[in-house]
Amino acid sequence: YNNFRKSMDSIGKKQYQVQHGSCSYTFLLPEMDNCRSSSSPYVSNAVQRDAPLEYDDSVQRLQVLENIMENNTQWLMKLENYIQDNMKKEMVEIQQNAVQNQTAVMIEIGTNLLNQTAEQTRKLTDVEAQVLNQTTRLELQLLEHSLSTNKLEKQILDQTSEINKLQDKNSFLEKKVLAMEDKHIIQLQSIKEEKDQLQVLVSKQNSIIEELEKKIVTATVNNSVLQKQQHDLMETVNNLLTMMSTSNSAKDPTVAKEEQISFRDCAEVFKSGHTTNGIYTLTFPNSTEEIKAYCDMEAGGGGWTIIQRREDGSVDFQRTWKEYKVGFGNPSGEYWLGNEFVSQLTNQQRYVLKIHLKDWEGNEAYSLYEHFYLSSEELNYRIHLKGLTGTAGKISSISQPGNDFSTKDGDNDKCICKCSQMLTGGWWFDACGPSNLNGMYYPQRQNTNKFNGIKWYYWKGSGYSLKATTMMIRPADF
């Protein structure tokens, strides 16, 4: 027990107060007259003596008091035991009730908390997603700014060194001009001398020309005889040719045709017997306009027209719409063949597209689309792809369905932002999408965590910039 007090109330009853936790119990007990000794009755109204009692009487009295005290003590002990027993029962009941009530309350509070937590988590997830998106955007913009700053710094340094070089050249040229003036005077004198000598020569040549003219007259006569002989021969040859074509056309109709010298694509070049890798001149369909392309005559059976190549970062791919339309770069190295040619070509017949990729760890992979074509410029050279196979990811890294082509000066993507300006290079950006093979070229050990690099997400992830890429097309029926 925490607290136990005994006191007397106004009418002489004994009062016991028990404190347990927040509960306090008060017991009012009557006086125990039956416990008093019969030999010495207690007189409640007896007057207190002035003089002390006799010794015997005192002893007796003390014994009676001791008995009463002993009885009281025993009775109190019984009472305490009784209280303790009752308290235990009551406490168990109280605790059970409390636990039941508190459990219900706690469950209710817990449910509310869970609901609130879930709601907060959802809101946090939304905010986190927005923050991530904005962070990514800001990172991209920062990257763009830092890149352009670096470019500007480099340009300023280059220009400063060029100015210094030009100043050195200027002073050098001034000296040269002075020296040349001196030489010029000497040369003028020698030219005058040469002129005199030439006049002598001219008069000699005139006499020789007269002699030659006489010989020409003789030759002309002989020439007319030769011409007649040549005419006769030509007639004979023509007759022979006519006879040959008549007899051969019955056997083989292709002989009469003129040999094909213009090719639409590398498949036609291959079929004509040219089976060596290299640069060939191709002709636009239904046109005389020509374009130079690299033909891969070895990979996968040959006949592949290379429409894009990245390998060393030697060519800048952050180009305008017009440049991507007509093509740029060097067909033997890094280049873009041209959207207009590819669009016209792939709308004539069915083509397959193969994309060959290399990473910086010596691995290679490819994606093959069994049907590929580009819409016309009217529809911003929108890409159309079907039937993906290959080792560079089971999902297409060129977003499906196809997107319009975008460049730094032609924002045709599905982002509120300008993907081409942020990620660099012309590409079929979505918003902004999982690939960009025309991004910034990053060298080894600088090629990770790059948002604007050469990306093929479903092979190497978003931040990995590839070492080399080749895009090639070939007729599906090759």
Epitope: S375, E377, E378, L379, N380, P401, G410, N412, K414
Partner: nanobody
Amino acid sequence: EVQLVESGGGLVQPGESLRLSCVASGFPSGFTFSDYQMYWYRQAPGKERELVAIISNDGLRKTYADSVKGRFTISRDNAKNTMFLQMNSLKPEDTAVYVCNVRRANRDDWGQGTQVTVSS
């Protein structure tokens, strides 16, 4: 050249809704409205033109500016050569001239625009 005509603008109170329409015509021979990706822009007085929403040619993919996300919905009816912009929970800061746009051969064709004013 393609002609784009917007309608549906007007004066509304904050929290109210409007539905803008953009009818397109005059596409080159061999091409139809359903071939083109379409855009809604807006320009508030003294501010730069802002791209509000994009819809793909098939109408399946849509993109919105952060400022209108969850309130505006872009859609199209290719059979009627029409694009829509459903604007809910309008705010005073949505006040602007709303213009529809199409990009062909990397060139822009614009409508005249329709005025939307949100004021109490």
